[in-house]
């Protein structure tokens, strides 16, 4: 058993049929010695008396808010949560495996630039009695500070018969050094509590590996005189790190016909303009990636050819 | 470069960008291999990193690029030695068309651009881990290449910025 926060305790249980459970001793936070009784949640049933209460925690029915009383007045509370371990693996019932970029990916994180700011998100089908808290640091043995904001419900989607909820959090490294080569990864730890179930999820990454630029902005097409070709131009997204002579992007451009089956020729360039043949009903698209490190490509920015 | 002269920024830019491409060809991102999970940080902890105080940021380069260039050169020589060691020559066998060979040569080429003959900066001691098992060697290979990708990305940014803003 360990203390998650004041008056909230997590009991770690090996979860299998007829498991013996954990013996837990609760102590009433009071100078009083006599006439103390104990109850669980709203039930008025007295579980025991005395300054300490010893219980055998085996299942969710044994978890909840234990309260010690004297003369009808509550003296202190201890909330017990359960953390299940099945076959040596901690349960992951609350969050959905996003399976990208690999199996057992519960938390996904992205950064738009090298400023030390990043966003993480996760999915669940649970809609009520659910709370999350997030901690983050750079490195674990001698951690450097990362400050995370409040967790927000960022999207709701219908998936078949189920509703899926996306939660997200924004974090900022306290003293980021955008130009340096990261040596220690960022660690993100999410505590999830659903009713009386506790679970924790972690992710470890370098900012460089989660970079995904915003799409290029201000796409423009300029027809060339007496030619089927057009001059296309675009700009770095506003959110990308500066100066651009240092934090450079590379671009992938393509012209996509109306039919998805039509062959698309992709061209790669470090410039912010190109000359292409842009037929009527087609569209021109461009996406960006860090020029020197193969992290994610941005989403496409598109403009119709006509 | 040593003694405060300016490097051939444009040449360094070209070669460092080539290094980035080769480093990713030699070890593309492989989905299932989260090498940090393997728990032997000490194997790549000795590699030189370009850190915050090394003057490799745009402001630091403007003030005095020498500190940064010296750091980059130390790293290039370190990685060049690693890529020529039995970590990369032993099993699992690399084919002669492997990008590792070109990477090795390009690291040497760039380090020489930064130090013409006759100048000698001190370089740090190269560790000699000699894993005997193919799986240890392969794991170490991947870690070195992932680390090199990060190192050459910063070096390439430095030379690109230098070529754009510091060239005579």
């Amino acid at each position: 058993i360990w203390e998650l926060k004041k008056d909230v305790y997590v009991v770690e249980l090996d979860w299998y049929p007829d498991a013996p459970g954990e013996m837990v001793v609760l102590t009433c936070d009071t100078p009083e010695e006599d006439g103390i009784t104990w109850t669980l949640d709203q039930s008025g049933e007295v579980l025991g008396s005395g300054k300490t209460l010893t219980i055998q925690v085996k299942e969710f029915g044994d978890a909840g808010q234990y309260t010690c009383h004297k003369g009808g007045e509550a003296l202190s509370h201890s909330l017990l949560l359960l953390h299940k371990k099945e076959d040596g693996i901690w349960s992951t019932d609350v969050l959905k495996d996003q399976k990208e970029p690999k199996n057992k990916t519960f938390l996904r994180c992205e950064a738009k630039n090298y400023s030390g700011r990043f966003t993480c998100w996760w999915l669940t089908t649970i809609s009520t009695d659910l709370t999350f808290s997030v901690k983050s640091s750079r490195g674990s043995s001698n951690p450097q500070g990362v400050t995370c904001g409040a967790v927000t419900l960022s999207a709701e989607r219908v998936r078949g018969d189920n509703k899926e909820y996306e939660y997200s959090v924004e974090c900022q490294e306290d003293s980021a050094c955008p130009a340096a080569e990261e040596r220690l990864p960022i660690e993100v730890m999410v505590d999830a509590i659903h009713k009386l179930k506790y679970e924790n999820y972690t992710s470890s990454f370098f900012i460089r590996d989660i970079i995904k630029p915003d799409p290029p902005k201000n796409l423009q097409l300029k027809p060339l005189k007496n030619s089927r070709q057009v001059e296309v131009s675009w700009e770095y997204p506003d959110t990308w790190s500066t100066p651009h002579s240092y934090f450079s992007l590379t671009f992938c451009i393509q012209v996509q016909g109306k039919s998805k089956r039509e062959k698309k020729d992709r061209i790669f360039t470090d410039k912010t303009s190109a000359t292409v043949i842009c037929r009527k009903n087609a569209s021109f698209s461009v996406q960006a990636q860090d020029r020197y490190y193969s992290s994610s490509w941005s989403e496409w920015a598109s403009v119709p050819c006509s | 470069v040593p003694g405060g002269s300016s490097p051939a920024w444009a040449q360094c830019q070209q070669l460092s960008q080539k290094l980035c491409t080769l480093a990713w060809s030699a070890h593309p991102l492989v989905g299932h291999m989260d090498l940090r999970e393997e728990g032997d940080e000490e194997t790549t902890n000795d590699v030189p990193h370009i850190q915050c105080g090394d003057g490799c940021d745009p402001q630091g380069l403007r003030d005095n690029s020498q500190f940064c260039l010296q750091r980059i050169r130390q790293g290039l020589i370190f990685y060049e030695k690693l890529l020529g060691s039995d970590i990369f020559t032993g099993e699992p066998s690399l084919l002669p068309d492997s990008p590792v060979g070109q990477l090795h040569a390009s690291l040497l080429g760039l380090s020489q651009l930064l130090q013409p003959e006759g100048h000698h900066w001190e370089t740090q001691q190269i560790p000699s881990p000699s894993p005997s098992q193919p799986w240890q060697r392969l794991l170490l290979r991947f870690k070195i290449l992932r680390s090199l990708q990060a190192f050459v990305a910063v070096a390439a940014r430095v030379f690109a910025h230098g070529a754009a803003t510091l060239s005579p």
Epitope: - | S25, A26, H27, P28, V30, H32, M33, E91, P92, S93, L94, L95, P96, D97, S98, P99, V100, G101, Q133, P134, W135, R137, L138, L139
Partner: antibody, heavy 120, light 107 residues
């Protein structure tokens, strides 16, 4: 896109030789090793060796040394595999293949195969 | 030479079944193992490399696992189009060697 096109099927007498070609396109010929793999009827695969056209250096599986000669013609982007002193057990489909660009020998692209039949 | 001992040599399973093919290397090959599928009369096709990385375009029902000497190819839910021969291949040490193959049929 990458293509490897092999020469047609051959029927040969025991003791004779055969030369199978593999014409490459869609990549820089001198940048890649070209490997040869054989498959006897109803059998598994056997790696025979490779040629690296950049410096014309072959590497052979010891089991095929003296039996096979690997060469390459840079001007036509064609690799050749010559088998000498043919015996009935050399009857097989012979494939050329090229590996991944990262320098390890898993084979992404294969020729269509050339059946060599040795029969008196 | 490194021997790659593949088993079973043939197997028959029903559509939807989970199918497992194993390969044992005679010595440590790290994760330098690939798996190929060869349909009758066709060229071998790469499925898996680095023991568990799926090649582009390979359906997610195919997965690989293992390291050092013991390797497994798993088809999570067998489909009629999976009827083929399957070969493992070590590319750690010269000469590169293949397993003897597994013939997979539908019951």
């Amino acid at each position: 896109q990458v293509q490897l096109v092999q020469s047609g099927a051959e029927v040969k007498k025991p003791g004779s030789s055969v030369k199978v070609s593999c014409k490459a396109s869609g990549f820089t010929f001198t940048d890649q090793t070209i490997h040869w793999v054989r498959q006897a009827p109803g059998q598994g695969l056997e790696w025979m060796g490779y040629i690296y056209p950049r410096d014309d250096s072959p590497k052979y599986n010891e089991n095929f040394k003296g039996k096979v000669t690997l060469t390459a013609d840079k001007s036509t982007s064609t690799a050749y595999m010559e088998l000498s002193s043919l015996r009935s057990e050399d009857t097989a489909v012979y494939y050329c293949a090229i590996p991944d660009r990262s320098g390890y020998a898993w084979f992404i692209y294969w020729g269509q195969g050339t059946l060599v039949t040795v029969s008196s | 030479d490194i021997q790659m001992t593949q088993s079973p040599s043939s197997l028959s399973a029903s559509v939807g079944d989970r199918v497992t093919i194993t390969c044992k290397a005679s010595r440590d090959v790290a994760i330098a193992v690939a798996w190929y599928q060869q349909k009758p009369g066709k060229v071998p096709k790469l499925l898996i490399y680095w023991a568990s990385t799926r090649h582009t375009g390979v359906p997610s029902r195919f997965s690989g696992s293992g390291s050092r000497t013991d390797f497994t190819l798993t088809i999570s839910s067998l489909q009629p189009e999976d009827v083929a021969d399957y070969f493992c291949h070590q590319y750690s040490s010269y000469p590169f060697t293949f397993g003897s193959g597994t013939k997979l049929e539908i019951k």
